[in-house]
Amino acid sequence: MAVTACQGLGFVVSLIGIAGIIAATCMDQWSTQDLYNNPVTAVFNYQGLWRSCVRESSGFTECRGYFTLLGLPAMLQAVRALMIVGIVLGAIGLLVSIFALKCIRIGSMEDSAKANMTLTSGIMFIVSGLCAIAGVSVFANMLVTNFWMSTANMYTGMGGMVQTVQTRYTFGAALFVGWVAGGLTLIGGVMMCIACRGLAPEETNYKAVSYHASGHSVAYKPGGFKASTGFGSNTKNKKIYDGGARTEDEVQSYPSKHDYV
């Protein structure tokens, strides 16, 4: 029963996690304009993996896709790749885990097959979660680097009275969604792997031994008994990502005072 519960919970947690990874990948708010220096901007910029957007005071929002592959930063391409790999692995993992669920009977599938499928999906979820966490972390690192670089160059190119103020970007909502979703997928994968241990039949086969007693011959042939390992209750859920950076503007509860201007 505990094994079924662990497997089912692992599946549900992974499902939520993968849905979150998909949502994060599609979201436009991977980076949002830092409003520390200008909290009353009339034009609010934010960027995703696929397009950059502007929300105006007028209420009008316009987005422009990145219609180039070669012109994009290698890091952005890497993040895209990591997120897509995470989604693909997660989706395959979900498909495999559906058939592996103990509560679902498909033909005469043996427990050993289900155990293998559970382990496979678990590993896929773990890798999927790690891909998402890695992708989001790479993007966050890129943001931090660019943030401090643009802070250092904030008023470069001041010719006379003309200031070219660079738009600085900070963490967007998608980063937090991605971190949480990646963490959930990872936890779900670990749970599936734990469930696999409970499903796997540990067969101890004793060879048939003949005892020749006086009078008549009796053959004792004990069948292989199944030793079921109990569900380890001491498994610790590790915190994948602690908090993360928060900006003064507490990015993005749409519309927030500062970003909707």
């Epitope: 009339a42 034009v43 609010f44 209420g59 200031q163 738009t167």
Partner: antibody, heavy 118, light 113 residues
Framework: EVQLLESGGGLVQPGGSLRLSCAAS????????MSWVRQAPGKGLEWVAT????????YYADSVKGRFTISRDNSKNTLYLQMNSLRAEDTAVYYC???????????WGQGTLVTVSS | DIVMTQSPDSLAVSLGERVTMNCKSS????????????LSWYQQKPGQPPKLLFY???TRESGVPDRFSGSGSGTDFTLTISSVQAEDVAVYYC?????????FGQGTKLEIK
């Protein structure tokens, strides 16, 4: 046809108060950000205040901050500008405007004259 | 605050002549999000409220004759009238739409010789 009609202007003494209204018609008022812009006699245009769709957020020119309050009543399709502690330099024609793409002001009312004088 | 400076303050031209007026901002009005310049141009005829001519620096408002054109990017912008007509006599204002406070240029007065 889009129409913006200002009212409430007039002669007021320094330190006095006045409330301007702008009746909007011909468009979905609640879906637009609205602004007030003023023009002193023989002078250029000066942005005064803006109120965002929904009315939650308001922005003011430094010259009027703390004295003027922009508000809106979407049920009445009306924009307001409450002007307190009026000064001689607030004398101007006050225009009610609608913001569109690019934060540009596509429609302007005919304006209402506010004269602050003793 | 972003300071908008227009030049010249006034100009007198003959009918049919090409005219150019400039607007300079103290900060870039180019948005990185959509690569649009947040500057608008207005025409104000005597005794009338201003009329929007261009937004996003070069996007013509509907109903504006195509003899008017807007151009420029970053901090330098231009309004051009290819062939001035009598009805173009007005004061032309540029406006920063990028950040609060919205600021207008002091205006360029166009007259006919």
């Amino acid at each position: 046809e889009v129409q913006l009609l200002e009212s409430g202007g007039g002669l007021v003494q320094p330190g006095g108060s006045l409330r301007l209204s702008c009746a909007a018609s011909g468009f979905t008022f609640s879906s637009y950000t609205m602004s007030w812009v003023r023009q002193a006699p023989g002078k250029g245009l000066e942005w005064v205040a803006t109120i965002i769709i929904g009315g939650s957020y308001t922005y003011y020119a430094d010259s009027v901050k703390g004295r003027f309050t922009i508000s809106r009543d979407n049920s009445k399709n009306t924009l307001y500008l409450q002007m307190n502690s009026l000064r001689a330099e607030d004398t101007a024609v006050y225009y009610c405007t609608r913001l569109v793409k690019g934060n540009a002001m596509d429609y302007w009312g005919q304006g209402t004259l506010v004269t602050v004088s003793s | 605050d972003i300071v908008m400076t227009q030049s010249p303050d006034s100009l007198a031209v003959s009918l049919g002549e090409r005219v150019t007026m400039n607007c300079k901002s103290s900060q870039s009005l180019l948005s990185s999000g959509n690569q649009k310049n947040y500057l608008s141009w207005y025409q104000q005829k005597p005794g009338q409220p201003p009329k929007l001519l261009f937004y996003w620096a070069s996007t013509r408002e509907s109903g504006v004759p195509d003899r008017f054109s807007g151009s420029g990017s970053g901090t330098d912008f231009t309004l051009t009238i290819s062939s001035v007509q009598a009805e173009d006599v007005a004061v032309y204002y540029c406006q920063n739409d990028y950040s609060y406070p919205f600021t207008f240029g002091q205006g360029t007065k166009l007259e006919i010789k």
